[in-house]
């Protein structure tokens, strides 16, 4: 019963985590304009992995996609790749884990096969979570580096009384969503791996059976039988990440007479 609960909970936690990773990947608020110097700006900038947006105080929001591959920073491409790999692995993991669930009966599938599949999905969830955490962390590191670089050159072109203030960017809501989602996927994966151990059939010790033949006595004692999972069933992966969540900024809708890409 505890095994089924652990497996079910692992599946649900991973499902939430992967949904979060997908949400974070699609979100536009990976980096948001730092409002420290101008808290009442009439123009608010924010950027995602796929497009950058500008929200005016008038309520009008304009988003522009990054219509180039080669012109984008290598780090951004790496983050995109990590997030996509995380989503793909997580999706495959979810698919495998559905069939591995103890509460679902598919034909005459043996417990050993279910244990195999549970472990496979668990490992996939762990890798998926790590990919998401890595992707978000790489982006966060990129932001921190750029933030301090732009702080160093905060005002460029101080010709007379004319100032050009550089826009600085800070952590957006998507980073926190990504960290939490990656952590949940990782936890779900660990739970699946733990559940796998309970699913694997225990070592069965059969009592010795004596066969009496005429003339001489032969005792037949079969050795202990152990189900092979195809993986090391004693795998213990207890790497757990716990992130903090922050809600996304409210975006006003605006009746637009134009249609922007």
């Amino acid at each position: 019963m505890a095994v089924t609960a652990c497996q079910g909970l692992g599946f649900v936690v991973s499902l939430i985590g992967i949904a979060g990773i997908i949400a974070a990947t699609c979100m536009d608020q990976w980096s948001t304009q730092d409002l420290y110097n101008n808290p009442v700006t009439a123009v608010f900038n924010y950027q995602g992995l796929w497009r950058s947006c500008v929200r005016e105080s008038s309520g009008f929001t304009e988003c522009r996609g990054y219509f180039t591959l080669l012109g984008l920073p290598a780090m951004l491409q790496a983050v995109r790749a990590l997030m996509i790999v995380g989503i793909v692995l997580g999706a495959i993991g979810l698919l495998v884990s559905i069939f591995a669930l103890k509460c679902i009966r598919i034909g005459s599938m043996e417990d050993s096969a279910k244990a195999n599949m549970t472990l496979t999905s668990g490992i996939m969830f762990i890798v998926s979570g790590l990919c998401a955490i890595a992707g978000v962390s790489v982006f966060a590191n990129m932001l921190v580096t750029n933030f301090w670089m732009s702080t160093a050159n905060m005002y460029t072109g101080m010709g007379g009384m004319v100032q050009t203030v550089q826009t600085r960017y800070t952590f957006g809501a998507a980073l926190f969503v990504g960290w939490v989602a990656g952590g949940l996927t990782l936890i779900g994966g660990v739970m699946m791996c733990i559940a796998c151990r309970g699913l694997a059939p225990e070592e069965t010790n059969y009592k010795a059976v004596s066969y009496h033949a005429s003339g001489h006595s032969v005792a037949y004692k079969p050795g202990g039988f152990k189900a092979s999972t195809g993986f090391g069933s004693n795998t213990k992966n207890k790497k757990i990440y716990d992130g903090g969540a922050r809600t996304e900024d409210e975006v006003q809708s605006y009746p637009s007479k134009h249609d922007y890409v």
């Epitope: 700006t41 009439a42 950027q47 004319v162 050009t164 203030v165 550089q166 826009t167 409210e250 009746p255």
Partner: antibody
Framework: DVQLVESGGGLVQPGGSRKLSCAAS????????LHWIRQTPEKGLEWVAY????????YYADTVKGRFTISRDNPKNTLFLQMTSLRSEDTAMYFC???????????WGQGTLVTVST | DIVMTQSPSFLTVTAGEKVTMSCRSS????????????LTWYQQKPGQPPKLLIY???TRESGVPDRFTGSGSGTDFTLTINSVQAEDLALYYC?????????FGAGTKLELK
């Protein structure tokens, strides 16, 4: 057709109060941010206050902060400006205006004159 | 606060000629996020409220004649009226639309020679 009509102006004693109204019609009132802008021959156009479509955020010019309060009643399609502790320098023609693309004001009312004098 | 400086204060013109007026801001109005300049131009005739002419420094509002052209970037902006008509005689204001408080220039008055 978009229409903004201000009312509530008049002669007020220094230190007194006044509430201006702006009745809107011809557009989805609750979908737009709105402003109060005033004009004097000496100072020209001066932005006073802004209220977003959802009533938050609200911004004020430093010259009126703490004395003026902007508010809106979306069901009634009305914008308000409550003015207190009025000074002679608050004497102006007060316009309400609709916020538009590029943070511009695309529609203005005809204005209401507020005179602060003894 | 961003200070808007308009020049000249007065402009005397004859019908049909090309007119150029300037607006300078104390801080750049160019937003890096969308590469748009947050500067607006208005026209005000006596006894009337201001009328929106141009936003985003160069985007003409619908219904505005194409003889009105806005240009410039960063801190220096220009409003050009090609072939001035009698109905164009008015006060022209530029406005900072980049950050609060939203500030206006003192205006350029277009007068007939």
């Amino acid at each position: 057709d978009v229409q903004l009509v201000e009312s509530g102006g008049g002669l007020v004693q220094p230190g007194g109060s006044r509430k201006l109204s702006c009745a809107a019609s011809g557009f989805s009132f609750s979908g737009f941010g709105l402003h109060w802008i005033r004009q004097t021959p000496e100072k020209g156009l001066e932005w006073v206050a802004y209220i977003s479509s959802g009533s938050r955020p609200i911004y004020y010019a430093d010259t009126v902060k703490g004395r003026f309060t902007i508010s809106r009643d979306n069901p009634k399609n009305t914008l308000f400006l409550q003015m207190t502790s009025l000074r002679s320098e608050d004497t102006a023609m007060y316009f309400c205006a609709r916020f538009y693309f590029g943070n511009s004001f695309d529609h203005w009312g005809q204005g209401t004159l507020v005179t602060v004098s003894t | 606060d961003i200070v808007m400086t308009q020049s000249p204060s007065f402009l005397t013109v004859t019908a049909g000629e090309k007119v150029t007026m300037s607006c300078r801001s104390s801080q750049s109005l160019l937003n890096s996020g969308n590469q748009r300049n947050y500067l607006t131009w208005y026209q005000q005739k006596p006894g009337q409220p201001p009328k929106l002419l141009i936003y985003w420094a160069s985007t003409r509002e619908s219904g505005v004649p194409d003889r009105f052209t806005g240009s410039g970037s960063g801190t220096d902006f220009t409003l050009t009226i090609n072939s001035v008509q009698a109905e164009d005689l008015a006060l022209y204001y530029c406005q900072n639309a980049y950050s609060f408080p939203l500030t206006f220039g003192a205006g350029t008055k277009l007068e007939l020679k």
